[in-house]
């Protein structure tokens, strides 16, 4: 029997609403699926909270290249960081007696492949990125984002789903990985650690960052997520590392300031629309890319991961708010919600820039060890 942690004090709706909710690969649907409904049908079917203005209201494509003060991944020391002293976990889970093996969590039992066999696949995420081994691929052009600068209305749903904090994105946010590789954004969520313990999912030469943002996209070739799961390129995730910096990040504050309203698992609230692109690094031209999986059950493969080379800076207070506000099931804090890095198993991580070329005095003759396989080759 679990004791709810002051459940009465936190309304489900907060102050005013994934990789997270899995679908088994055996559930992949047939071709004749009907389109999903954005909103439940109402009698008068008023516009839902997620409804968006039409195309003519969307801002122009915003390729970013201007420099920011944030650290670049190739600037990191190449010294191997000490391994994490602990496995990622969700602390102090108290589950009901006789809990079956279908409910996954971070750390401990059950092993994820028992929850979803795809989690034992050969091409899983996250991975450790080693820039020196990345294949420079000039065909990887700057990412293009369209419609990511949202007006305050309609409001967006911010939800504590027990695994992360997730912001549901409205229709109309378009992203292109390149010509003919077009996607629409579905949601963003974060992964983090705990006090003094970093919690990014991807690592760089063994270095784990304080936190990581994932913006999850559905290929425009598919009408619904349930059609796209497990299909090559059906989903694409933009990932960026979050680091500590001297100043408050005003874009992130719009979300972090609302976390207390959704402290309990299952609670949600509405937040004004914001510039989603402001949550990402400004340099859309330098990134790493590889094919992997969802980082939570069902761990479906075929996901295109794009990991920005530039990081995003948050203040120490903001990082503390992120890691110390939310609760998972029962009386467990929602912390250390990252999966361990997975083996590449022969995959080559591509880079849109010559990441393997180290301009520091330590590398007299930098060599690119892997060659690029351009998209479509």
């Amino acid at each position: 029997q679990r004791l709810p942690r002051m459940q009465e004090d936190s309304p489900l709706g907060g102050g005013s609403s994934g990789e997270d909710d899995p679908l088994g690969e055996e559930d992949l649907p047939s071709e004749e699926d009907s389109p999903r409904e954005e909103d439940p049908p109402g009698e008068e079917d008023l516009p839902g909270e997620e409804d968006l203005p039409g195309e003519e209201d969307l801002p122009e494509v915003k390729p970013k290249s201007e420099e920011e003060g944030s650290l670049k991944l190739e600037d990191l020391p190449t010294v191997e960081a000490p391994g994490d002293p602990q496995e990622p976990q969700n602390n102090a889970h108290r589950d009901k007696e006789g809990d079956d093996q279908s409910h996954w969590r971070y750390g401990g039992d059950p092993p994820w492949p028992r929850v979803s066999p795809a989690c034992a696949g050969r091409f899983q995420s996250p991975v450790d990125i080693r820039p020196q081994l990345a294949a420079f691929c000039p065909a990887l052009r700057p990412l293009e984002l369209l419609g990511f600068q949202l007006p305050p209305l309609p409001e967006l749903r911010l939800r504590n789903n027990g695994h992360s904090v997730q912001l549901t994105l409205p229709p109309g946010l378009e992203m292109a990985l390149g010509p003919g590789r077009e996607y629409r954004a579905l949601q963003l969520h974060l992964h983090w650690g705990a006090a003094g313990r970093p919690g990014s999912e991807h690592t760089v030469e063994g270095h784990r960052f304080p936190a990581e943002i994932h913006v999850v996209h559905l290929s425009t070739a598919f009408a619904r997520v349930d059609e796209a799961l497990g299909r090559p390129g059906g989903l694409a995730v933009l990932a960026a590392f979050l680091e500590e910096g001297p100043e408050e990040n005003s874009a992130y504050e719009q979300l972090l300031s609302r976390l207390e309203e959704i402290a309990e698992e299952g609670s949600e609230t509405q937040v004004p629309g914001l510039d989603i692109s402001a949550l990402l690094p400004s340099d859309f031209s330098r990134y790493f890319q590889y094919e992997g999986s969802l980082t939570t059950p069902p761990c479906a493969q075929g996901v295109i991961w794009t990991v920005f080379n530039q990081t995003v800076m948050l203040s120490a207070k903001q990082l503390h708010t992120l890691s110390d506000t939310l609760w998972g099931p029962g009386d467990s804090r929602l912390q250390l919600n990252f999966r361990a890095t997975q083996p590449l198993n022969g995959r080559v991580i591509e880079a849109s820039f010559p990441a393997g070329v180290d301009s520091s005095p330590r590398a007299a003759e930098p060599v690119q060890l892997n060659s690029c396989l351009a998209a479509g080759d």
Partner: nanobody, 115 residues
Framework: QVQLVESGGGLVKPGGSLRLSCAAS????????MRWYRRAPGKQRELVAY???????NYADSVKGRFTISRDNAKNSLYLQMNSLRAEDTAVYYC?????????WGRGTLVTVSS
Amino acid sequence: QVQLVESGGGLVKPGGSLRLSCAASGITFNLHAMRWYRRAPGKQRELVAYISARDWTNYADSVKGRFTISRDNAKNSLYLQMNSLRAEDTAVYYCNTDLVGEDYWGRGTLVTVSS
């Protein structure tokens, strides 16, 4: 294909009870958090109750102590037991889940509380 089908709505007097059901297909049901929402005429959609894959539950303040959400993973079914119903509970009730952040909804079942 993910499908959610609600049933159990109807006309009930104040103080009465109803039990709503939601049959799910096309998903590995026992891996999913599930939710009941409602939309009253002329009002915004409201989250009523939540149940995680681990059976952790959470409720809107307006229904705490009166409504109980539950699930039967063997039957791929979600339930909402509604007791001590009030006129303000009148609404269309929707079953909801999401896959990787994309919402899936049933068509709803109408609950009318009136004397």
